[in-house]
Interface confidence: medium
């Protein structure tokens, strides 16, 4: 007779693992049992289960509740047995033992590998902001045996570095991802990916990129000097500017208060019927928490009676 | 060639206590469940005590639990069976048995329970 087994046994942690075992016999012969040990190099074999025909199945203290026999209709040559509950301490050599009349006994090891899948986490790094060099966006971590693979999808452009911890029985894997802030990175998708053959698809886990910066300030609204004159409605100076995070923006004139009657209105300054009081030097500061910048403008209401040319000047600073 | 050979049978008295014995060769008896059984006269033969291979887990008939205990010793290939409190309904001719699907059967030894 021969005896028929796995050279390895693959499940995945909290899993039952059937470890086969099928004895094919000749004509005549019987099995009397089936024992099953574990028989890892350097220890003593530990006895799981006694299969017996008649008075069925034995499971010895240390395996009790977590040895059964695969559910009926059994074949009376098939000394396989189920493994409940796989966790990663049963990893290792096992042995059937099966003992036939008269022919004698029969043995077959196999090896029991407990897949252990990861559970990654996703760790942003410290702030980014756009004039630093190259700086960390992220690092993904997971653990597993055996090893996960970790990688990145982005459209980002950046680099990437990996570094294994091997622990007794599993391996944990951090994969950094570095890139240079710019803000075109603001609200763009870092993914890590983890693979392992525990899964049954990739584990992803995507973090939003947020690039502090603060854009040059400048100030619309004098593009046309001529409208500029006494007693025009709905003059208003806007300024522009853009950040992460989104910034703040306050007016002041440099040469004294604001005129009685001028609104502020967060990025806008308006303007009652123009009078000659109006003319001087707005300043727009704009801030966020990563940066400010101002951008100053000269206001030059003209009389229309009055030939003379009018002047506009305009100074941005940061 | 199996070989299985019974003895420690005899005459005894009600409540009291015999010790049988069941010498193995010709396999490995390390291997196997090994079990005892009895016939009286007149009657089918019926199942007294087993005993697991690694000498765990024995198993009794109703009638002798608590009275008889199975135990094997591998170093030596021999299966006992303690019988205490005997009572005259014991009387039997006692059996040593391979536990496989189609019992091997020794030649088996008297065991007489009377005043």
């Known amino acids: 007779g021969e005896l028929e087994t796995s050279d390895v046994v693959t499940v995945v942690l909290g899993q039952d693992a059937k470890l086969p075992c099928f004895y094919r016999g000749d004509s005549g012969e019987q099995v009397g049992q089936v024992a099953w040990a574990r028989v890892d190099a350097g220890e003593g074999a530990q006895e799981l289960a006694l299969l017996h025909s008649k008075y069925g199945l034995h499971v010895s203290p240390a395996y009790e509740g977590r040895v059964e026999q695969p559910p009926p209709p059994r074949n009376p040559l098939d000394g396989s047995v189920l493994l409940r509950n796989a966790v990663q301490a049963d990893e290792g050599e096992y042995e059937c033992r099966v003992s036939t009349f008269p022919a004698g006994s029969f043995q077959a090891r196999l090896r029991l590998r407990v897949l252990v899948p990861p559970l990654p986490s996703l760790n942003p790094g410290p702030a980014l902001e756009e004039g630093q060099g190259l700086t960390l966006a992220a690092s993904c971590t997971a653990e597993g045996s055996p090893a996960p693979s970790v990688t990145w999808d982005t459209e980002v452009k950046g680099t990437t570095s990996s570094r294994s911890f091997k622990h007794s029985r599993s391996a944990a894997v951090t994969s950094e991802f570095h890139l240079v802030p710019s803000r075109s990175m603001n609200g763009q998708p870092l993914t890590c990916v983890v693979s392992h053959p525990g899964l049954l698809q990739d584990q992803r886990i995507t973090h939003i990129l947020h690039v502090s910066f603060l854009a040059e300030a400048s100030v619309r609204g004098l593009e046309d000097q001529n409208l500029w004159h006494i007693g025009r409605e709905g003059a208003m100076l806007k300024c522009l500017s853009e950040g992460q995070p989104p910034p703040s923006y306050n007016w002041t004139r440099l040469d004294g208060p604001l005129p009685s009657g001028v609104r502020v209105d967060g990025d806008t300054l308006g303007f009652p019927p123009l009078t000659t009081e109006h003319s001087g030097i707005y300043v727009c500061h704009v801030s966020n928490e990563f940066s400010s910048r101002d951008s100053q403008v000269t206001v030059d209401v003209l009389d229309p009676q009055e030939d003379s040319g009018k002047q506009v000047d305009l100074v941005s600073a940061s | 060639e199996v070989q299985l050979l019974e003895s420690g049978g005899g005459l005894v008295q009600p409540g009291g206590s015999l010790r049988l014995s069941c010498a193995a060769s010709?396999?490995?008896?390390?291997?196997?469940?090994m079990g005892w059984y009895r016939q009286a006269p007149g009657k089918e033969r019926e199942f007294v005590s087993a005993?697991?291979?690694?000498?765990?887990?024995?198993y009794y008939a109703d009638s002798v639990k608590g009275r008889f205990t199975i135990s094997r010793d591998n170093s030596k290939n021999t299966l006992y069976l303690q019988m205490n409190s005997l009572k005259p309904e014991d009387t039997a001719v006692y059996y040593c048995a391979v536990e496989v699907p189609y019992d091997y059967w020794g030649q088996g030894t008297q065991v007489t329970v009377s005043s």
């Open positions: 010709g396999f490995t008896f390390s291997d196997y469940y």
């Open positions: 005993i697991s291979s690694t000498g765990g887990s024995p």
